[in-house]
């Protein structure tokens, strides 16, 4: 890579594009800002669909996060000859649908979606727009919006979870490329660390998970710390703060040397989780340490 | 376990509104994401989806019986209601509703429905 | 709408693998499920999203979906898999089934 910021996060990526007529001579810019910035989410545990829509919705790459398989996609994606309308609310629906097949698996990874148009929406088409990203929510994502061109940034601001959720590129497609970076910081929940990651058996801790996005959540009292212990049983905690670039948690009291817990996070009130490789483990304590 | 029950009249005259009842168990359509189909079956015949109700209260139909139909639900009593307005022979055929939202994975045992005079 | 297409019938020996057809315009792009039916039964869901299998179906019930093409395989297929088949997608808030197929176990 280029050496530029990337992201560590565990989650399900979605790209909406729009590959309506309006965009033809403009296809090359969408390619490389989605490839560009494809290449920054980096965790083993991050899967991503490309979804593209114009008259029709289709699910290009379906959810994966097989590298091999994403480089494929992003090939596909490069294939992509724009044409026909701006129904965005059918590529929200295959988004949804997604969603809903992994959430019906039984464990709920957190959802990002990250959707691009140019232009104004029809009002039916937008009310259609804005219930399917409606629907995305239910399901427990993170809807954030790109608008290039012509875009009708309050009507944005609503198929998006809020205002600060839409990415206004006002200079056209080719200043798409300026916005990869407050995107990605934007669109990025990522655990980091934890400390301490070795704990006492049998002793109530806090911990502190250091990362990044913790308050991009729609409403961060809805934020939670997940510890998956020993692979089974998943307990939730409510933090004690949140800040964008941490957590203080209080930790569960693991009674034996040697259980794991592998920490996530849920932005919506455990409807979903954000996956790490961070894992809290336990040893023994002396009364004197 | 999940459970959902069709009731409603065997017999309908021509012309007539036919009203159908799903009453279900085992979840709750209080819960995100799902919700409850109707699909019917002629005779000998392929299934056919008719509508869809989702747990936010978003309703959809069948483009070719639209203005026929009406879904609604009642969340304290787990029941969804169809109601099929102005019955045909045609519509002879037994009516299952189905718990799902993209896919349906618990379906009712079907309640068939003859349209005569 | 999309529209699915299936084979009206498909007739597999006992221990044979039965492989069943569901066509439709770019059918790669969306994802496509597969229901089981006996007679004077509600249907059943064997496969869901192209692929996973709900709990309780056997593993010889297996799904692939690309290009304009989706297809249920029964490996080893068993007398008790003898029932119409049909396969149903998502498209523009509807949910719509194939024709169906009548599976048919030889002997």
């Known amino acids: 890579e280029d050496g530029g910021p990337a992201c560590y996060g565990g989650f399900d990526l979605y790209f909406i594009l729009d590959k309506s007529g309006s965009v033809l001579h403009h296809w090359n810019e969408i390619y490389y800002f989605v490839e560009q910035l494809a290449h920054r989410f980096i965790s083993p545990q991050l899967r991503m669909s490309f979804i593209v829509f114009s008259t029709r919705g289709t699910t290009l790459m379906k959810l994966t996060e097989d590298r091999e398989q994403i480089r494929q996609g992003l090939e596909e994606l490069q294939k992509v000859l724009p044409g026909g309308d701006t129904y965005m609310h059918e590529g929200f629906e295959r988004a949804s649908e997604q969603i809903y097949y992994e959430n019906s698996q039984g464990y709920r990874t957190a959802s990002v979606i990250i959707a691009l148009t140019d232009g104004e929406l029809h009002e039916d088409l937008f009310f259609y727009s804005e219930r399917e990203a409606n629907r995305s929510r239910d399901l427990g994502a993170i809807v954030y919006c790109v608008g290039v061109k012509d875009f009708n940034e309050t009507q944005l601001a609503r198929i998006a979870d809020s205002k600060d959720h839409v990415f206004p590129v006002n200079d056209g497609f080719q200043a798409l490329q300026g916005i990869i970076h407050s995107i990605l910081k934007k669109s990025c929940i990522e655990i980091l660390a934890a400390e301490p990651s070795t704990i006492c058996a049998g002793e109530s801790f806090q911990v502190v998970v250091r990362g990044n996005g913790f308050r991009h959540a729609r409403n961060v009292d809805r934020v939670l710390c997940s510890f998956k212990i020993n692979d089974s049983v998943t307990l939730n905690e409510k933090p004690f703060a949140v800040e964008d670039t941490y957590l203080l948690c209080p930790a569960p009291i693991l009674k034996e040397v040697g259980m794991k817990a592998a920490l996530q996070v849920s932005m919506n009130d455990g409807l979903s989780f954000i996956s790490s490789s961070v894992i809290i483990t336990t040893t023994h304590c002396s009364d004197g340490s | 376990q999940v459970q959902l029950k069709e009731s409603g009249p065997a017999l309908v005259k021509p012309t007539q509104t036919l009203t159908l009842t799903c009453t279900f168990s085992g979840f709750s359509l209080s819960t995100s994401g799902g919700g409850v189909s109707w699909i019917r079956q002629p005779p000998g015949k392929a299934l056919e989806w008719l509508a869809h109700i989702y747990s936010n209260d978003d309703k959809s139909y069948s483009t070719s019986l639209k203005t026929r139909l009406t879904i609604s639900k009642d969340t304290s009593k787990n029941q969804v209601v169809l109601t099929m307005t102005n019955m045909d022979p045609v519509d002879t055929a037994t009516y299952y509703c189905?718990?799902?939202?993209?896919?349906?994975?618990?379906w009712g045992q079907g309640t068939l429905v003859t349209v005569s005079s | 709408d999309i529209e699915l297409t299936q084979p009206p019938s498909v007739s597999v020996a006992p221990g044979q693998t039965a492989r069943i057809s569901c066509s439709g315009d770019n059918i790669g792009g969306i994802y496509v499920h597969w229901y089981q039916q006996k007679p004077g039964q509600a249907p059943v869901l064997v496969i869901y999203?192209?692929?996973k299998r709900p709990s309780g179906i056997p593993e010889r019930f297996s799904g692939s979906n690309s290009g304009n093409t989706a297809t249920l395989t029964i490996s080893g297929t068993q007398a008790e898999d003898e029932a119409d088949y049909y396969c149903q997608s998502y498209d523009i808030t509807s949910l719509v089934f194939g024709g169906g197929t009548k599976l048919t176990v030889l002997g």
């Open positions: 189905a718990r799902g939202g993209y896919f349906l994975d618990y």
């Open positions: 999203a192209d692929s």
